[in-house]
């Protein structure tokens, strides 16, 4: 048993069929000795009596709200969540796995730049009685700070006949120094509570490897005279690190006709613009990534042919 | 009519062990907490343990793990395992249905003694 937070308590259990379960003591917060009595939860059945009481943990029947009391009055709270672990694996059952970039991929992040900003999300299909609070750090054994706000539900999708929820995250690393190189990871760490159910998911990684730019902005197009060509132009986004002479991006240029099935033609450059032939009924599309580093690229930015 | 009858008590030395029972009838036994009870020679009635409909337990604290409680629903019977007795464990064990003991059986005496 270990505590999550003041007058919350997380009881670890070995989960499968008859499992003894934990002997956990729980000490009235009182300088009171006598006449104390214990309630769990909403019932008025007392429990038991003394200062502390020794309670055996094995479901969720035995977790929840334990109360003292004397003579009518509260005196202390404390709440018992559950942890499971069954065949040796901590349970999963709150978070949804999203399977990218590989199994059992509960959290997702991804930054725009090297600021040490960053975002996480992830999916549930719970909609009542969640919380999450959400810690991370760079390095785990002398660790540096990050500032992380509170997760917020971010979007709802009907997935076939369930309904998707996505919470999401922001952290700021404390003293980040976007030229240097990382040596050690980024870690996050998200605790989950549903009901009296407690279950926690981290993730690791270097800023550099979860790089995703902001797509180009001001994607412009110049027609040249007596030709079917034009010249594509763009900018950096706003977000992405600067100098640019420093941080920066090579670009995807694309022309897409109407139809999917159209062959697509591709030109890659380092330069903000590209000259394109420009075909009835396409549009023209580009993207961003890192220049040195292979991470992710940008969604398109796109504009139509017309 | 409710009606709780305990059995298995008696004379033990002190380390030993015994295996109270309660045998419950007249109430659906299941959907009810259920505790045991004790009454020291001269003493009020103190309370020992507590299980609840889910199975789980609750001990006081001079039981510091040597007690064990458990239920068999499909025999209505409620039983308190005791290990390694104590001389200060001698007393009338009663099974109730409420924790100040207002539905409860005429108990079993249990001695710790050499």
């Known amino acids: 048993i270990w505590e999550l937070k003041k007058d919350v308590y997380v009881v670890e259990l070995d989960w499968y069929p008859d499992a003894p379960g934990e002997m956990v003591v729980l000490t009235c917060d009182t300088p009171e000795e006598d006449g104390i009595t214990w309630t769990l939860d909403q019932s008025s059945e007392v429990l038991g009596s003394g200062k502390t009481l020794t309670i055996q943990v094995k479901e969720f029947g035995d977790a929840g709200q334990y109360t003292c009391h004397k003579g009518g009055e509260v005196l202390s709270h404390s709440l018992l969540l559950l942890h499971k672990k069954e065949d040796g694996i901590w349970s999963t059952d709150i978070l949804k796995d999203q399977k990218e970039p590989k199994n059992k991929t509960f959290l997702r992040c991804e930054a725009k730049n090297y600021s040490g900003r960053f975002t996480c999300w992830w999916l549930t299909t719970i909609s009542t009685d969640l919380t999450f609070s959400v810690k991370s750090s760079r390095g785990s054994s002398d660790p540096q700070g990050v500032t992380c706000g509170a997760a917020t539900l971010s979007a709802e999708r009907v997935r076939g006949d369930n309904k998707e929820y996505e919470y999401s995250v922001e952290c700021q690393e404390d003293s980040a120094c976007p030229a240097a190189e990382e040596s050690l990871p980024i870690e996050v760490m998200v605790d989950a509570v549903h009901k009296l159910k407690y279950e926690n998911y981290t993730s690791s990684f270097f800023i550099r490897d979860i790089i995703k730019p902001d797509p180009p902005k001001n994607l412009q197009l110049k027609p040249l005279k007596n030709s079917r060509q034009v010249e594509v132009s763009w900018e950096y986004p706003d977000t992405w690190s600067t100098p640019h002479s420093y941080f920066s991006l090579t670009f995807c240029v694309q022309v897409q006709g109407k139809s999917k099935r159209e062959k697509k033609d591709r030109v890659f450059t380092d330069k903000t613009s590209a000259t394109v032939i420009c075909r009835k009924n396409a549009s023209i599309s580009v993207r961003a990534q890192d220049r040195y580093y292979s991470s992710s690229w940008s969604e398109w930015a796109s504009v139509p042919c017309s | 009519e409710v009606q709780l009858v305990e059995s298995g008590g008696g004379l033990v030395q002190p380390g030993g062990s015994l295996r109270l029972s309660c045998a419950a009838s007249?109430?659906?036994?299941?959907?009810?907490?259920m505790y045991w009870l004790r009454q020291a020679p001269g003493k009020g009635l103190e309370w020992v343990s507590t299980?609840?409909?889910?199975?789980?337990?609750a001990y006081a604290e001079f039981v510091k793990g040597r007690f064990t409680i458990s239920r068999d629903n499909a025999k209505n019977t409620l039983y308190l395992q005791m290990n390694n007795l104590k001389p200060e464990d001698t007393a009338l064990y009663y099974c109730?249905?409420?924790?100040?003991?207002?539905?409860r059986g005429q108990g079993t005496q249990v001695t710790v003694s050499s």
């Open positions: 109730a249905r409420d924790f100040e003991g207002t539905v």
């Open positions: 007249g109430f659906t036994f299941s959907g009810y907490w």
């Open positions: 299980i609840k409909t889910t199975g789980g337990g």
